[in-house]
């Protein structure tokens, strides 16, 4: 059955004949309507791409490099399927580019200019292609030949396989450049023992050199690892402290119609009957016809990449900024010390046109991208689409999860003359409910809820990390009869009590009317029976102070708040009746802007903060009548976080452990593709 | 009611001007910034050029140096200098006031304008 079939691509006869090989035995396991093989035979690996993207064939196991071809318009392929390394209790599916150095040395990766320099050889990725992709624009010019410019750049370099003619300097250190163990310095661990033994001052190799060339923890502590961010951290930290991290071997498909199911299915299969120690007849990881046919011989196994996981994602920031430096040889002309405008990221309509209004306001110093979900804006700041965004803490810990980190706290009780050096505590989640009505923290079963989003701190993280470790289970559209928590599955009976309009219906996001703190409000007051809102939204909704037609007429004292020891309270006692403390929202940015990010912002809100008095006249960065555009309206000002700058110190011990345990119940796809 | 009515769009070949206008009504005009917009036939919804209400503009990348933005707040009309038109500049121009805080959505029919040759 055509449909059934993964048409596989080799890219030479020992290929083609392991391919067939491949075909055959997978053939006399599989039942007859499984998936099965066909192959397909190419010249090269790039004719394997072009091949895959034309539909002609549909799968090929591709190094980096080529997976960011195979991302490149117009192929538009993506990877579904990575080879794993090591045990399958502890899969590597990355390794780490990293620049290591002696301990006793003082620069820092800024002040390489002027280094001696090992590599492990031309055309490398972690020896060469990396770290020269990331210094591209710091080269001296003219950049070409590239090999001029990074013998102009360091004092003298061991670059084995380079042309020792032409860049003598490339060879200083390893007289010939030799471009086999022949060469003492050759490779990884030659390129390493060209740093211990004095010759260089840095080495580019990957996170395991050290590690395989020095069994002893006392020996391995006189080196450190130099971070991009111009720090320097120990060789174990090499998961915070890298150039890039770079899968190794990864199957690809297309985007659209690829048969990434198909495909894994196959896969998996063929691993349970022919992986390592499986079968005598055939092996996937080894073949008697050549190295590394199909698959990597030092491979163990597969794992299925997650759906949301795109290229990008997956190749990561770094890397594809070190590949397409050195491919397209472009620079900003701007020096790279100097801040460029700052790309905001908005959610969706509402959010965009105040983004836009911010932007004509700083006179161009911010710019705006826009996507239809928090998780969409997050994986725009990972990849590079987009710069910051403020979040709610539950987006806080999945932002860290993937890599970003916080940049300045929103505050919302401290008055502005201490306020921007001020770390506030945080605010109360609290359970809302009609005064008429008698339900306490005991009895919510087979009620209407209404939440701010899922995800979310006080709407989601908080209660239903409470009830959780009530009954046991994730089914919580089974606990409540109905009710709004947009992101929930559209066939969720948490999304029956949201009002839309379709096709925006239970979407995270302001076209959906009861998204956020004043939408799970207004569905409390329209529909519901309890809301898991921020302690300040019902006095911030009634009394006059929303004029929309639904809460203009609203009065605080027929709200009260749920405690958790099953009394109520009214809303004017968050302190003595709430479910949790929250972390404030925070500004959020990948870590090589996060500096330029708080500059701008504490720039911007000195001439758009809550300084100014009259918003229908001037543009108010705090301020969108209840709807928390970009900001929560009640922001008072954006603080800076001392030493909390890490998604775990921010958030602080005890909500980490609760969003953690929740994750058994998680449904974010953004969160599965960062901790793959 | 804010009223935002576009007028001056048209069919100009490449490299030809137009100048566009918004007259404003209802609308707290004299205060509040002011923007552009533009819609190409499938695409979303872009900014294209902003002013504040003390008079500093703001382009996007592709129209600076051919685009000029400015405000008569007498009249309380927006205007859109457009020189040196481009075959992909071809949308539907929209004008909007901030001024309602991105609460309700206001916005003209649009003026037309088509860039060939």
């Known amino acids: 059955v055509p449909e059934k079939s993964v048409r596989w691509c080799a890219v030479s006869e020992h290929e083609a004949t392991k391919c067939q090989s491949f075909r055959d035995h997978m053939k006399s396991v599989l039942p007859s309507n499984g998936p099965s093989v066909a192959c397909v035979k190419k010249a090269s690996h790039l004719d394997c791409i072009r091949a895959i993207a034309a539909n002609e064939a549909d799968a090929v196991t591709l190094d980096a490099g080529l997976v960011y071809d195979a991302y490149l318009a117009p192929n538009n392929l993506k990877p579904v399927v990575a080879e794993f390394y090591g045990s399958k209790e502890d899969p590597q599916t990355f390794y780490y580019a990293v620049a290591v150095v002696k301990k006793d040395s003082d620069f820092q990766m800024n002040q390489l200019r002027g280094r001696k320099s090992c590599h492990t050889g031309l055309g490398r990725s972690a020896g060469w292609n990396i770290p020269i992709g990331l210094l591209y624009c710091d080269l001296p010019e003219p950049r070409k030949p590239l090999e001029k410019a990074v013998a102009n750049f360091f004092s003298g370099s061991c670059v084995p396989c380079a042309d020792g003619t032409d860049f003598p300097q490339l060879c200083q250190l390893c007289p010939g450049c030799g471009c086999s163990t022949l060469n003492q310095y050759f490779s990884y661990s030659g390129a390493f023992k060209c740093l211990k033994d004095g010759a260089g001052d840095v080495a580019f190799v990957k996170h395991s050199t050290i590690f395989e060339n020095l069994a002893n923890k006392a020996d391995r502590d006189q080196y450190e690892l130099l971070c991009l961010d111009n720090t320097r951290k120990s060789v174990d930290e090499y998961k915070d402290c890298h150039l890039a991290r770079v899968p190794s071997h990864t199957v690809v498909a297309r985007s659209v119609g690829g048969k990434e199911d198909l495909i894994w299915e196959l896969l998996n299969q063929a691993q349970e009957h022919f992986g390592k120690d499986k079968s005598k007849e055939f092996q996937l990881f080894s073949s008697p016809h050549g190295k590394d046919l199909l698959f990597k011989d030092s491979a163990h196994g597969f794992l299925k990449v997650p759906p949301r996981m795109d290229a990008k994602m997956y190749l990561g920031y770094e890397y594809i900024t070190a590949i397409r430096n050195l491919r397209e040889g472009t620079c900003p002309e701007a020096p790279t010390d100097e801040c460029k405008p700052v790309k905001w990221c908005a959610l969706s309509h509402h959010e965009r046109l105040k983004c836009d209004e911010w932007s004509v306001n700083s006179a161009g110093k911010i710019e705006c991208e826009s996507a239809e979900t928090t998780e969409d804006c997050i994986a725009k700041i990972m990849n590079g689409e987009a710069d910051a965004m403020s979040l709610d803490g539950g987006f806080v810990y999945i932002a860290g999860m993937c890599g970003l980190v916080p940049v300045l706290a929103e505050n919302y009780n401290t008055p502005n003359p201490n306020c921007e050096n001020t770390a506030e505590e945080g605010y109360f989640a609290v359970a809302v409910v009609k005064s008429s009505s008698d339900l306490t923290w005991d009895n919510l079963k087979g009620k209407k809820s209404c939440h701010t989003a899922v995800g979310r701190t006080a709407g989601w993280n908080i209660p239903m990390g409470l009830l959780y470790s009530k009954i046991n289970h994730c089914r919580f559209d089974e606990f409540f009869s109905e009710g709004c928590a947009p992101g929930s599955e559209k066939n969720s009976s948490l999304c029956k009590l949201c009002m839309g309009p379709s096709p925006n219906l239970c979407e995270p996001n302001n076209k959906e009317g009861y998204y956020g703190y004043t939408g799970a409000f207004r569905c409390l007051v329209e529909k519901g029976d309890v809301a898991f809102v921020k302690h300040q939204t019902v006095p911030q909704n009634t009394g006059g102070k929303n004029p929309d037609a639904w809460a203009k007429n609203l009065k605080e004292e027929d709200y009260e708040l749920l405690c958790l020891d099953g009394s109520r309270k009214s809303v004017q006692e968050p302190a003595n009746c709430h479910l949790a403390r929250a972390p404030n929202h925070a500004v959020v940015a990948r870590k090589d802007k996060a500096d330029c990010v708080q500059t701008l912002l504490l720039d911007q809100q000195r001439m758009f903060g809550s300084s100014v008095t009259d918003c229908s006249s001037n543009f108010c960065l705090f301020e969108s009548k209840t709807k928390d555009l970009l900001f929560r309206d009640d922001t008072v000002c954006l603080a800076k976080l001392h030493d909390r700058n890490t998604y775990e110190k921010y958030l602080g011990e005890e909500y980490v452990k609760a969003v953690t345990n929740l994750r058994k119940c998680s449904t974010s796809p953004l969160l599965e593709a960062c901790t793959f | 009611e804010v009223q935002l009515v576009e007028s001056g769009g048209g069919l100009v070949q490449p490299g030809g001007s137009l100048r566009l206008s918004c007259a404003a009504s209802?609308?707290?005009?004299?205060?509040?910034?002011m923007a552009w917009y533009r819609q190409a036939p499938g695409k979303g919804l872009e900014l294209v050029a902003g002013i504040t209400r003390s008079g500093s503009t703001n382009y996007r990348d592709s129209v600076k140096g051919r685009f000029t933005i400015s405000r008569d707040n007498s009249k309380n009309t927006l205007y859109l200098q457009m020189n040196s038109l481009r075959a992909e500049d071809t949308a539907v121009y929209y004008c909007t006031d901030y001024s309602s805080r991105y609460y309700h959505d206001y916005w003209g029919q649009g003026t037309l304008v088509t860039v060939s040759s």
């Open positions: 209802g609308s707290i005009f004299s205060i509040a910034t």
